[in-house]
Interface confidence: medium
C-alpha cells in the first residue's frame, strides 16, 4: 500500500507515534516519506547482506528476521515480511522499540539527512487529525 501523506499521519497518530519519545508526528511522516516514499512494501538491500523492510525501512540485521541475514538479532521478534503489511501496526511497534534504543530517530539515516532540523510540521499541515 502507498499511503497518502495525511492518511499516514492519521494512522501513525492512531498508533501512538505523535510525540513518542519526544518526536512529533511530523518527524515520523517525514521519515516515512524519505525512507520508503510512503510505500509499505518497500524493500532495499544493504551492502552488509541485510535488507530494509517497510514504510520505515526497518533493518533485518537488528530488528526483524528474514531468514537470511547472517547474525540477525531480531530484536523486535517479528518476521520482516510483517513489516510489509498494509497494516502498519508491526512497523510502528518495532519503530517504538528502535527509537527507544538510545539513538532516538538518528537510527533512520533518511530522517537524519532529510528531516532533522527542518520544519517537519509541514508534513502534517492541512491534515485533519
Amino acid at each position: 500500500k502507498v499511503f497518502g501523506r495525511c492518511e499516514l499521519a492519521a494512522a501513525m497518530k492512531r498508533h501512538g507515534l505523535d510525540n513518542y519519545r519526544g518526536y512529533s508526528l511530523g518527524n515520523w511522516v517525514c521519515a516515512a516519506k524519505f525512507e520508503s516514499n510512503f510505500n509499505t512494501q518497500a524493500t532495499n538491500r544493504n551492502t552488509d547482506g541485510s535488507t530494509d523492510y517497510g514504510i520505515l525501512q526497518i533493518n533485518s540485521r537488528w530488528w526483524c528476521n528474514d531468514g537470511r541475514t547472517p547474525g540477525s538479532r531480531n530484536l523486535c521478534n517479528i518476521p520482516c515480511s510483517a513489516l510489509l503489511s498494509s497494516d502498519i501496526t508491526a512497523s510502528v511497534n518495532c519503530a517504538k522499540k528502535i527509537v527507544s534504543d538510545g539513538n532516538g530517530m538518528n537510527a533512520w539515516v533518511a530522517w537524519r539527512n532529510r528531516c532533522k532540523g527542518t520544519d517537519v510540521q509541514a508534513w502534517i499541515r492541512g491534515c485533519r487529525l
Epitope: A42, T47, D66, G67, P70, P79, A82
Partner: antibody
Framework: QVQLQESGAEVMKPGASVKISCKAT????????IEWVKQRPGHGLEWIGE????????YYNEKFKGKATFTADTSSNTAYMQLSSLTSEDSAVYYC?????????WGQGTTLTVSS | DIELTQSPATLSVTPGDSVSLSCRAS??????LHWYQQKSHESPRLLIK???QSSSGIPSRFSGSGSGTDFTLSINSVETEDFGMYFC?????????FGGGTKLEIK
C-alpha cells in the same frame, strides 16, 4: 515438511517466452524469498534473482534483467519465472530454492530446451 | 561481483580416502559461505552453511572450515555415495554467486 515442486520440462522455439512455476508447501510462503538459479553444463550454477512473495519485491542479477520476470501468487503458494525472447543460450535446468541466505530447499528443476 | 574459485576442478579418490576441497573468494565474505553436493540429474543438496555449520541430516564425515577468503570442505573417509559435484556459494552480497564446482570421482 518444506517442499518446492516445479513445473515440467519445456521445449520452446527461439524468440518465444516460457513461464516456469514453483509451488511451495510446508512453510509460510509469503515470508521467505524465493530464489531462481540457472544451471547449464559447463557453466555451473548462476543466480538469476529473487522474489518476496508477500510483497512482490524483486531483485534481479544484472545479467538477467530483461530476460527473466518473477511473479508470485500467495493464494496458491506458487512463484513463477517468465523467460522471454528465448535463444539457445537459455537452454538449461532452472531451479527455484527457498532463500535463507543458504539454499536448504530446492525444487527438482525444470529443463528448458530451446530449439528450432 | 564476488568470484568464487574452487580447486581442484576434479579430484580422483578411492573410497576410504579423506579429502579436502577448496573454495577461494575474490574478497572477504566473513563466514557467509555454503557448500552443496550435487549428483547427476539431481538438485543440489545443502551440506554446510555459514562455513562450518552442518545441515540437518548430513553425515558427520562432512565438515567445513574457513573465514574471510579461504574455505575448505573436508570429507573424512569418502564413501561411494559421496561421488559427484561439489559447489560453494556466497551470501555475503548480491548477486549471489557460486563456485565453478569440484568433481569428486572414483579413482
Amino acid at each position: 515438511q518444506v517442499q518446492l515442486q516445479e513445473s515440467g520440462a519445456e521445449v520452446m522455439k527461439p524468440g518465444a517466452s516460457v513461464k516456469i512455476s514453483c509451488k511451495a508447501t510446508g512453510y509460510t510462503f509469503s515470508t521467505y524469498w524465493i530464489e531462481w538459479v540457472k544451471q547449464r553444463p559447463g557453466h555451473g550454477l548462476e543466480w538469476i534473482g529473487e522474489i518476496l512473495p508477500g510483497s512482490g519485491s524483486t531483485y534481479y542479477n544484472e545479467k538477467f534483467k530483461g530476460k527473466a520476470t518473477f511473479t508470485a501468487d500467495t493464494s496458491s503458494n506458487t512463484a513463477y519465472m517468465q523467460l522471454s525472447s528465448l535463444t539457445s543460450e537459455d537452454s538449461a535446468v532452472y531451479y527455484c530454492a527457498r532463500g535463507d541466505g543458504w539454499y536448504g530447499y530446492w525444487g527438482q528443476g525444470t529443463t528448458l530446451t530451446v530449439s528450432s | 561481483d564476488i568470484e568464487l574459485t574452487q580447486s581442484p576442478a576434479t579430484l580422483s579418490v578411492t573410497p576410504g580416502d579423506s579429502v579436502s576441497l577448496s573454495c577461494r573468494a575474490s574478497q572477504s565474505i566473513s563466514n557467509n559461505l555454503h557448500w552443496y553436493q550435487q549428483k547427476s540429474h539431481e538438485s543440489p543438496r545443502l551440506l554446510i552453511k555459514y562455513a562450518s555449520q552442518s545441515s540437518s541430516g548430513i553425515p558427520s564425515r562432512f565438515s567445513g572450515s574457513g573465514s574471510g577468503t579461504d574455505f575448505t570442505l573436508s570429507i573424512n573417509s569418502v564413501e561411494t555415495e559421496d561421488f559427484g559435484m561439489y559447489f560453494c556459494q556466497q551470501s555475503n552480497s548480491w548477486p549471489r554467486t557460486f563456485g565453478g564446482g569440484t568433481k569428486l570421482e572414483i579413482k
